[in-house]
Interface confidence: medium
């Protein structure tokens, strides 16, 4: 990833004419807020689907969406939008949200095959998956409050989740 995201390019983009954009692409004067999973491309003067750029250098424009997409492809992981992180189910089995039910229930049936992540989790560690930028910002969870995005999941102070800046 280049690290040169396009999201900073708010500018005063003008779309001088209405054109046809199937599949929900928006047009209109200075339209810079886009539907979810789309981003505003100032040069093209329209909202674009994030799917089209997830494999490109400019992925940071849609960083959260693209991470979510790649995360969902990995077995035993899910993307948490509040934490903006790819969460390994193995690291939270036992307190897992419904997204991890299938993975955790299968794993817990055969505890002999506990993966290293789960073993680490039992000693108070949480796996953290970062993007290429390697830039983090701590997100504090007050005590053991449940995360709204993770029903039933409580993160203790020693399970601070790291999120992308």
């Amino acid at each position: 990833m280049s690290g040169l995201g396009r999201s900073r390019r708010g500018g005063r983009s003008r779309v001088d004419q209405e054109e046809r954009f199937p599949q929900g692409l928006w047009t209109g004067v200075a339209m810079r807020s886009c539907p979810e999973e789309q981003y505003w491309d100032p040069l093209l003067g329209t909202c674009m689907s994030c799917k089209t750029i997830c494999n490109h250098q400019s992925q940071r424009t849609c960083a959260a969406f693209c991470r979510s997409l790649s995360c969902r492809k990995e077995q035993g992981k899910f993307y948490d939008h509040l934490l903006r992180d790819c969460i390994s189910c193995a690291s939270i089995c036992g307190q897992h949200p419904k997204q991890c039910a299938y993975f955790c229930e299968n794993k817990l049936r055969s505890p002999v095959n506990l993966p290293p992540e789960l073993r680490r989790q039992r000693s108070g560690e949480v796996e953290n998956n970062s993007d290429n930028s390697g830039r983090y910002q701590g997100l504090e969870h007050r005590g053991s409050e449940a995360s709204p995005a993770l029903p039933g999941l409580k993160l203790s102070a020693d399970q601070v989740a790291l999120v992308y800046s």
Epitope: S2, L4, R6, R8, R9, G11, R12, S13, R14, V15, E19, R20, F21, P22, Q23, L25, D41, P42, L43, L44, G45, T46, M48, S49, T52, I53, N55, H56, Q57, S58
Partner: antibody, heavy 118, light 107 residues
């Protein structure tokens, strides 16, 4: 490697139409936007418009509204640029150029010369 | 539309010379400035994107600098194959616009 191959030179009468093609290879056709750029003899580059092959969305420069129509054929990874009601002002080389998602045109077709002459 | 003004419109230089071409945007375009090289009868070729990032295969004698409205393309030591016309292009706001070109000729 990425290649954009355009159709050959055309000579047209005033009032006629012309359709120029640009066949893409070496990348996923629907993942990139294709632009068209005009260059009159001995002059600079002028942006005309673009097409998004994945959904055929188009946007044209105001100057070319009503003059140009861009289409694409996903089955052959080809984009087309049609000019209508040709006049001598349309005599130029037309280029297709791939947008790199970061503000640049990273690959260009070889160009198609359209000559409008009575 | 953003106007892109290149200067000079032409220049004469010799092999080995250091050549500088400037491009000015009518409003802030951040670093979204590209440079293209075009030879007679050929399509433009991308040299530089995002002000200073060389496109693949472009020799390191080409360099770019600037930000906001003022940008520069420098050829540190001109070679025979560098005699061509150079265009700048802003990629920050719709619609994309090009400079008028700078022709680099043999002295």
């Amino acid at each position: 490697q990425v290649q954009l191959v355009q159709s050959g030179a055309e000579v047209k009468k005033p009032g006629a139409s012309v359709k120029v093609s640009c066949k893409a290879s070496g990348y996923t056709f629907t993942n990139y936007v294709m632009h068209w750029v005009k260059q009159k003899p001995g002059q600079g580059l002028e942006w005309m418009g673009y097409i998004l092959p994945y959904n055929d969305g188009t946007k044209y420069a105001q100057k070319f509204q009503g003059k140009v129509t861009m289409t694409s054929d996903k089955s052959t990874s080809t984009v087309y640029m049609e000019l209508s009601s040709l006049t001598s002002e349309d005599t130029a080389v037309y280029y297709c150029a791939r947008y790199d998602w970061e503000g640049s045109f990273d690959y260009w077709g070889q160009g198609t010369l359209v000559t409008v002459s009575s | 539309d953003i106007q892109m003004t290149q200067s000079p419109s032409s220049l004469s230089a010799s092999v080995g010379d250091r050549v500088t071409i400037t491009c000015r945007a009518s409003q802030d375009i951040s670093n979204y400035l590209s440079w293209y090289q075009q030879k007679p009868g050929k399509a433009p070729k991308l040299l530089m994107r995002y002000t200073s990032r060389l496109h693949s295969g472009v020799p390191s004698r080409f360099s770019g600098s600037g930000s906001g409205t003022d940008f520069t393309l420098t050829i540190s030591s001109l070679e025979q194959e560098d005699f061509a016309t150079y265009y700048c292009q802003q990629g920050n706001l719709f619609p994309p616009t090009f400079g008028g070109g700078t022709k680099v000729e043999i002295k």
